[in-house]
């Protein structure tokens, strides 16, 4: 999916008002210096591509974050403010229902969500030069 035509300001507002808080809740009890940010993004469409991948694609050691509250809200924001995004999710939703697993917060998941926090922060500051 190409995130170029999303309403970035609306997505940013949703992040600032609610998604960011859910990410913090998920990470509660973890030191902010515990994980190094290894995933980066260069512009807003790229950031959303990375955010989607890290939020919804299962990875080794972290089977699924998709049922977490921050993920549900991310999915909603993309569906509402990214043209045509919802139709790409029809089959994905059916597949996710089939493989729904028990929620387990592993260290790998905490690391992944820490990366997500970094990506979201970068998304909110699109004019900053890449380090």
């Amino acid at each position: 999916y190409d995130f170029t035509n999303c309403d970035f300001e609306k997505i940013k507002a949703a992040y600032l008002s609610t998604i960011s808080k859910d990410l913090i809740t998920y990470m509660s009890g973890t030191k902010s210096t515990e994980f190094n940010n290894t995933v980066s993004c260069s512009n807003r469409p790229h950031c959303l591509t990375e955010i989607q991948s890290l939020t919804f694609n299962p990875t080794a050691g972290c089977a699924s974050l998709a049922k977490e509250m921050f993920a549900m809200k991310t999915k909603a924001a993309l569906a509402i403010w990214c043209p045509g995004y919802s139709e790409t999710q029809i089959n994905a939703t059916q597949a996710m229902k089939k493989r729904r697993k028990r929620k387990v917060t592993t260290n790998k998941c905490l690391e992944q969500v820490s990366q997500l926090q970094g990506l979201w922060r970068r998304f909110n500051r699109p004019l900053l030069k890449q380090q």
Epitope: A14, A76, I80, G84, E87, Q89, I90
Partner: antibody, heavy 120, light 107 residues
Framework: QVQLVQSGAEVKKPGASVKVSCKAS????????MHWVRQAPGQGLEWMGT????????DYNQNFKGRVTMTTDTSTSTAYMELRSLRSDDTAVYYC?????????????WGQGTLVTVSS | EIVLTQSPGTLSLSPGERATLSCRAS??????VHWYQQKPGQAPRLLIK???QSISGIPDRFSGSGSGTDFTLTISRLEPEDFAVYYC?????????FGQGTKVEIK
């Protein structure tokens, strides 16, 4: 089963405001956005905007910007649409309709409609 | 804003005949089109979602097709209860919009 029950018909004077309610039951309220669509007598359907409880935010059709406010009360699973500075051409049936925001993505259930008549 | 144009405005047919309704979008919208039926004094009822996906409880004589800019709703054999107004809607991008409607009337 899923039900959206709207408030009763209203008669308003030009310049006044109207607030229409839509009480939802039979589903998880925050899993769906509530959209508002109106239909003037003998005319087609016009999307007015939506409120998304999950994100606690709204998005409006520019045609109504500044005149409309959409809210929800999650404790009672009720959505509200307030339209201000009413004009005679706001006379219409106003519908609420739910739409999934993390699945479904379509207006699959509608309220029965609320007739708002604007007349001096 | 995406404009949806439905044709014809009115379709005069007899029960048992096939009805073909068209909806054209002003720009490509992939498959983000849905079809609704509305009878006098009633709220719209969802018939088809995402261009061609069937809806539980809707008779299989209703079918949809198309993608991009051109979409079609087909009623294979008209029943007396099918005479109504039909609207297409796009949810590709905000603001969501509807076509102006096609009235299917008894000939």
């Amino acid at each position: 089963q899923v039900q959206l029950v709207q408030s009763g018909a209203e008669v308003k004077k030009p310049g006044a405001s109207v607030k229409v309610s839509c009480k939802a039951s039979g589903y998880i309220f925050t899993d769906y956005a509530m959209h508002w669509v109106r239909q003037a007598p003998g005319q087609g359907l016009e999307w007015m905007g939506t409120f998304i409880p999950l994100l606690d935010t709204s998005d409006y059709n520019q045609n109504f910007k500044g005149r409309v406010t959409m809210t929800t009360d999650t404790s009672t699973s009720t959505a509200y649409m307030e339209l201000r500075s009413l004009r005679s051409d706001d006379t219409a049936v106003y519908y609420c309709a739910r739409m999934g925001v993390t699945h479904s993505y379509v207006m699959d259930a509608w309220g029965q409609g609320t007739l708002v008549t604007v007349s001096s | 804003e995406i404009v949806l144009t439905q044709s014809p405005g009115t379709l005069s047919l007899s029960p048992g005949e096939r009805a073909t309704l068209s909806c054209r979008a002003s720009q490509p919208i992939s498959i983000s089109v849905h079809w609704y039926q509305q009878k006098p004094g009633q709220a719209p009822r969802l018939l088809i979602k995402f261009a061609s996906q069937s809806i539980s409880g809707i008779p299989d004589r209703f079918s949809g097709s198309g993608s991009g800019t051109d979409f079609t709703l087909t009623i294979s054999r008209l029943e007396p209860e099918d005479f109504a107004v039909y609207y297409c809607q796009q949810t590709f991008s905000l603001p969501y919009t509807f076509g102006q409607g096609t009235k299917v009337e008894i000939k």
